[in-house]
């Protein structure tokens, strides 16, 4: 799997999980989240060469098509596969509120 | 939706569905499929600017991150959203066999 265990251990130009820390205030302009101040969002990036972690029949076909037609621009792309939620604390006035924001953290990637 | 109805009607540099006809023999080197000779596989391509059809909370956050941090390389990518199967006819010896290949045709795209 193109997850932290594999990607953060290997120098990999191909599609892989990349570390990215987002500071809510500095990077998003969000002052409304009290805790955490930021989080490890991560992101997916890298080349998708022939059959590198292709996740669908279509991406495998496209991968093969590109190998046979190298001038083609129709190549698969490195995107998130597994995502996890992030629990945040914010205030509605003086009242603290805990909320789980879905699909905030990328755990693994795929070529799609 | 970034589907044929929208994308094939508009000239769109941003992430959109693109037409792609794949000839099994010529483009994939597959001689084993008897019918059809090829099919409209389509593919997704184009830029994913600020919040263009972002499909998850993470891709929206990443989009906002990129706007505030334009030097960042952590941008969403244009990939397939809805896929459909393709029914094919092939032969096992002299015996015709009909098979449905899943996720062969891209119907719409998203920034992920």
């Amino acid at each position: 799997a193109l997850d932290a265990a594999y990607c953060f251990r290997n120098v990999q130009d191909n599609c892989c999980l990349r570390p990215l820390y987002i500071d809510f205030k500095r990077d998003l302009g969000w002052k409304w989240i009290h805790e955490p101040k930021g989080y490890n969002a991560n992101f997916c990036a890298g080349a998708c060469p022939y059959l590198w972690s292709s996740d669908t029949q279509h991406s495998r076909v496209l991968s093969l098509y590109n190998t046979i037609n190298p001038e083609a621009s129709a190549s698969p792309c490195c995107v998130s596969q597994d995502l996890e939620p992030l629990t945040i604390l914010y205030y509605i006035g003086k009242t603290p509120k805990i909320e789980q924001l879905s699909n905030m953290i990328v755990k693994s990637c795929k070529c799609s | 939706a970034l589907d044929a109805a929208y994308c094939f009607r508009n000239v769109q540099d941003n992430c959109c569905l693109r037409p792609l006809y794949i000839d099994f023999k010529r483009d994939l080197g597959w001689k084993w499929i008897h019918e059809p000779k090829g099919y409209n596989a389509n593919f997704c391509a184009g830029a994913c600017p600020y919040l263009w059809s972002s499909d998850t909370q993470h891709s929206r956050v990443l989009s906002l991150y990129n706007t505030i941090n334009p030097e960042a390389s952590a941008s969403p990518c244009c990939v397939s959203q809805d896929l459909e199967p393709l029914t094919i006819l092939y032969y096992i010896g002299k015996t015709p066999k009909i098979e449905q290949l899943s996720n062969m045709i891209v119907k719409s795209c998203k920034c992920s």
Epitope: I92, K94, L101 | V61, L64
Partner: antibody
Framework: DVQLVESGGDLVKPGGSLRLTCVAS????????MHWVRQAPGKGLQWVAY????????YYADSVKGRFTISIDNSKNTLYLQMNSLKTEDTATYYC?????????????WGQGTLVTVSS | DIVMTQSPGSLAGSPGQQVTMNCRAS???????LAWYQQKPGQHPELLIY???SRAPGVPDRFSGSGSGTDFTLTISNLQAEDVANYYC?????????FGQGTKLEIK
């Protein structure tokens, strides 16, 4: 320069529907919580609803809950207020406003307002 | 809901004079959950004071806010003709946000 421009106000019959639009410019739209506030003719200000961009957390005043829907198109820098089952007491000038940063906060920029008249 | 009560309902002052208006909350807001707005005739509200005493950018220092708990005051010194407006207090300590009914300021 920060600008908020509302539109969509009209004369509508009781029970009717209307959609108000607020287009923002001059700042990173998705960084600030957005509110709708209304003002009946000759009266004071009444808060209607808020939405947190990107995460789409919304909250409503009891008087409009179940009838009004606040939404946002982050990519178009646009805030909406879908108003259904309108009542005569919904007659007001509707303002969109942005907060200083917190969910409930002072509102540092306001639109010019759009007038909604509910009358038979 | 927190009820905000403003007094007086209206007041008149002479140019150059100092005027004060009050805002009382039905329960304690703490020290920083109150804002003041100015609304000139036919215009949208404009933020004057937030956090009970912090002036919004571009607001003249003739405007000042004070108070904590349930009692807050807006003071306008060196009154000008352009200060004719309705003034509203707003609490944001608790949901829903609520506003006072307003104080109408006129120039003698």
């Amino acid at each position: 320069d920060v600008q908020l421009v509302e539109s969509g106000g009209d004369l509508v019959k009781p029970g009717g529907s209307l959609r108000l639009t607020c287009v923002a410019s001059g700042y990173t739209f998705s960084s600030n919580v957005m509110h709708w506030v209304r003002q009946a003719p000759g009266k004071g200000l009444q808060w209607v609803a808020y939405v947190i961009p990107i995460v789409d957390i919304a909250y409503y005043a009891d008087s409009v809950k179940g009838r009004f829907t606040i939404s946002i198109d982050n990519s178009k820098n646009t805030l909406y207020l879908q108003m259904n089952s309108l009542k005569t007491e919904d007659t007001a000038t509707y303002y969109c406003a942005r907060t200083l940063g917190l969910v409930l906060d002072a509102m540092d920029y306001w639109g010019q307002g759009t007038l909604v008249t509910v009358s038979s | 809901d927190i009820v905000m009560t403003q007094s007086p309902g209206s007041l008149a002052g002479s140019p150059g004079q100092q005027v004060t208006m009050n805002c009382r909350a039905s329960q304690s807001l703490g020290s920083s959950y109150l804002a003041w707005y100015q609304q000139k005739p036919g215009q949208h509200p404009e933020l004057l004071i937030y956090g009970a005493s912090s002036r919004a950018p571009g607001v003249p220092d003739r405007f000042s806010g004070s108070g904590s708990g349930t009692d807050f005051t807006l003071t306008i010194s060196n009154l000008q003709a352009e200060d004719v407006a309705n003034y509203y207090c707003q609490q944001y300590a608790d949901s829903p946000i609520t506003f006072g009914q307003g104080t109408k300021l006129e120039i003698k």
